[in-house]
């Protein structure tokens, strides 16, 4: 067990042109808050997939009102860390989504309105117990600077928070075979004995005699990959005849808890422990109703008239996401041919074509070689929207007008003489050298009997020959 901690340092306009407008104004003061979603592994799942490692919501930041005419500065941030507790082992590799939300504090009916300002995502490797890792992510014209770390909750220690520490029994040293628990040198690694046969790679224990599985593994000894479940046996190990160790489906399999809720089995079913801001049997209710205006960009809110029923946003064309907060990236379909640059102007798509191509989707290939001539017997080659000359031997340059000297780059080593030849170049090697470019001394530097290295050189040392 442990805690993932996120510290937001700044949120403001990124470098470069096109600074964003301040999200707040004198007429509409606002404040920021952040949401973090964590998933195990290096998954590239959709933003809406469950935050299986956990999620957290920050407190609201100070109220901010834009000073008229002033550029958007770094915006005032909420105090404190965002903390995402994890109950099991820290996976080491994880994916994150950090969302910056704006809460408008105008006098609109129904209380404050929320809108998503920016969303950044990434995949990282991180060992628990390590130092703070710093990061900068950009979303559009906004830039988010933050640090994060994972730390184990005592008595857990180690890079995955799976080793346990106990206070020392003797003042001087730990028992046989047990290390001190850095950085807690006054504690010793506990002699934790998992269930006999528990997989050292895929299982761990927090109490002696148990065997708990890392994600993706199952069975009493965590030796069976979840995906290979071909057994339809009752829950628990089946009879010896099938040799099948895969448990049947359990109520928490596939994690029925949404929004980062953690699932625990009960005698009859399951129970979701929901993160702050969510509730319901499966943490599917966010505490937000249609009265709060949760649908952005003209989305139509349906349901959710009372706090116990969830709302659904029906998004207008061009937007998607559970709150219609994401613009559909029509350029992701790559409508522009031949390397054209796609511009989504909102009302229309526009393709900016590379040289040599034209048409609404850059589908027309112009004749690159039309009216172009290559000198000295060179031939024009079309391609990529720019003509290129394939030059005859002995000539070079864009239009084959330059006489090429194959010997200009001193291509013969060890004093070999270079001769330009109709087929390229020829090296006439100095005595004692051979190879196409005279790069191999026949008897290196006259090295005589042992030691077996050129004089004054140990094998492995570089030696300069000009």
């Amino acid at each position: 067990a442990g805690v993932f901690e996120l510290q937001i340092h700044s949120f403001g306009p990124g470098p470069g042109p096109g600074a964003p407008r301040s999200p707040c104004s004198a007429r509409l003061p606002c404040r920021l808050f952040f949401r973090v979603c964590l998933k195990p592994g290096l998954s590239e799942e959709a933003a809406e997939s469950p935050c299986a490692l956990g999620a957290a919501l920050s407190a609201r930041g100070p109220v901010y009102t834009e000073q008229p005419g002033a550029p958007a500065p770094d915006l005032p941030l909420p105090d404190g860390l965002l903390q995402v507790p994890f109950r099991d082992a820290w996976p080491g590799t994880f994916s994150f989504i950090i969302e910056t939300w704006r809460e408008e504090l105008g006098d609109q009916i129904g209380g404050p309105a929320w809108s998503l300002l920016a969303r950044v995502a990434g995949r990282r490797r991180l060992a628990a117990g390590g130092p703070w890792a710093r990061d900068i992510q950009r979303a559009g014209a906004w830039e988010l600077r933050f640090s994060y770390r994972a730390r184990c909750e005592p008595p857990a220690v180690g890079t995955a928070c799976t080793r346990l520490c106990r206070p020392r029994s003797a003042p001087s040293r730990c028992g046989p075979g047990l290390r001190p628990c850095a950085p807690l040198e006054d504690e010793c690694e506990a002699p934790l004995v998992c269930r006999a046969g528990c997989s050292p790679e895929h299982g761990f224990c927090e109490q002696p005699g148990e065997c708990r599985c890392l994600e993706g593994w199952t069975g009493p000894l965590c030796t069976v990959p979840v995906s290979t479940s071909s057994c339809l046996s009752p829950r628990g190990p089946s009879s010896a005849t099938t040799g099948c160790l895969v448990p049947g489906p359990g109520p928490c399999d596939g994690n029925p808890c949404a929004n980062g809720g953690s699932c625990s089995e009960t005698p009859r079913s399951f129970e979701c422990t929901c993160p702050r801001g969510f509730y319901g049997l499966r943490c599917e209710v966010s505490g937000v109703t249609c009265a709060d205006g949760p649908c952005f960009n003209g989305g139509l809110c349906v349901g959710g008239a009372d706090p116990d029923s969830a709302y659904i946003c029906h998004c207008p064309p061009g937007f998607q996401g559970s709150n219609c907060e994401k613009r559909v990236d029509r350029c992701s379909l790559q409508p522009c041919r031949n390397g054209g640059l796609c511009l989504d102007l909102g009302h229309a798509l526009r393709c900016r074509c590379r040289a040599g191509f034209a048409g609404p989707r850059c589908e027309h290939d112009l004749d690159d070689c039309a009216g172009r001539a290559c000198a000295n017997g060179g031939t024009c080659v079309e391609g990529g929207g720019a003509h290129r000359c394939s030059c005859a031997l002995g000539f070079g340059g864009r239009d084959c007008r330059e006489r090429a000297d194959p010997c200009a780059a001193r291509p013969c080593a060890h004093g070999g003489r270079c001769y330009a030849h109709f087929s390229g170049l020829v090296c006439a090697c100095a005595p004692g050298y051979m190879g196409a470019r005279c790069e191999f001394p026949v008897h290196p530097d006259g090295a005589s009997a042992l030691p077996a290295a050129p004089p004054g050189l140990r094998p492995g040392d570089p030696q300069r020959y000009l």
Epitope: G435, G460, R464
Partner: nanobody
Framework: EVQLVESGGGLVQPGGSLTLSCAAS????????MAWYRQAPGKKRELVAG???????DYIDSVKGRFTISRDNAKNSVYLQMNSLRAEDTAVYYC???????????WGQGTLVTVSS
Amino acid sequence: EVQLVESGGGLVQPGGSLTLSCAASGSRVSFLSMAWYRQAPGKKRELVAGISKDGSTDYIDSVKGRFTISRDNAKNSVYLQMNSLRAEDTAVYYCYAYRWTTRVTYWGQGTLVTVSS
């Protein structure tokens, strides 16, 4: 700085075969001209086979048809396949690299090949 590490030497009977490997680090072998040299006790070090940057190969007369030098760009290594080995092939075999950008040569530490019945 280019580092060269040879491996694959050992004891082999006359007529047997052996493959020597030379793993390079610090530069890609495709940018280097590389060769195998050998030095028998009491004798000068001599070139055995070379492979130029462009892939052309050279051999001394006594190994032509028996030894083959090759390069694997993906593994960043050069190999010497030695067939029909003779007692006179017994020597320490050294890997050599010539770096064209700096015109500097580099040597490995050597691997011993013993041909004996």
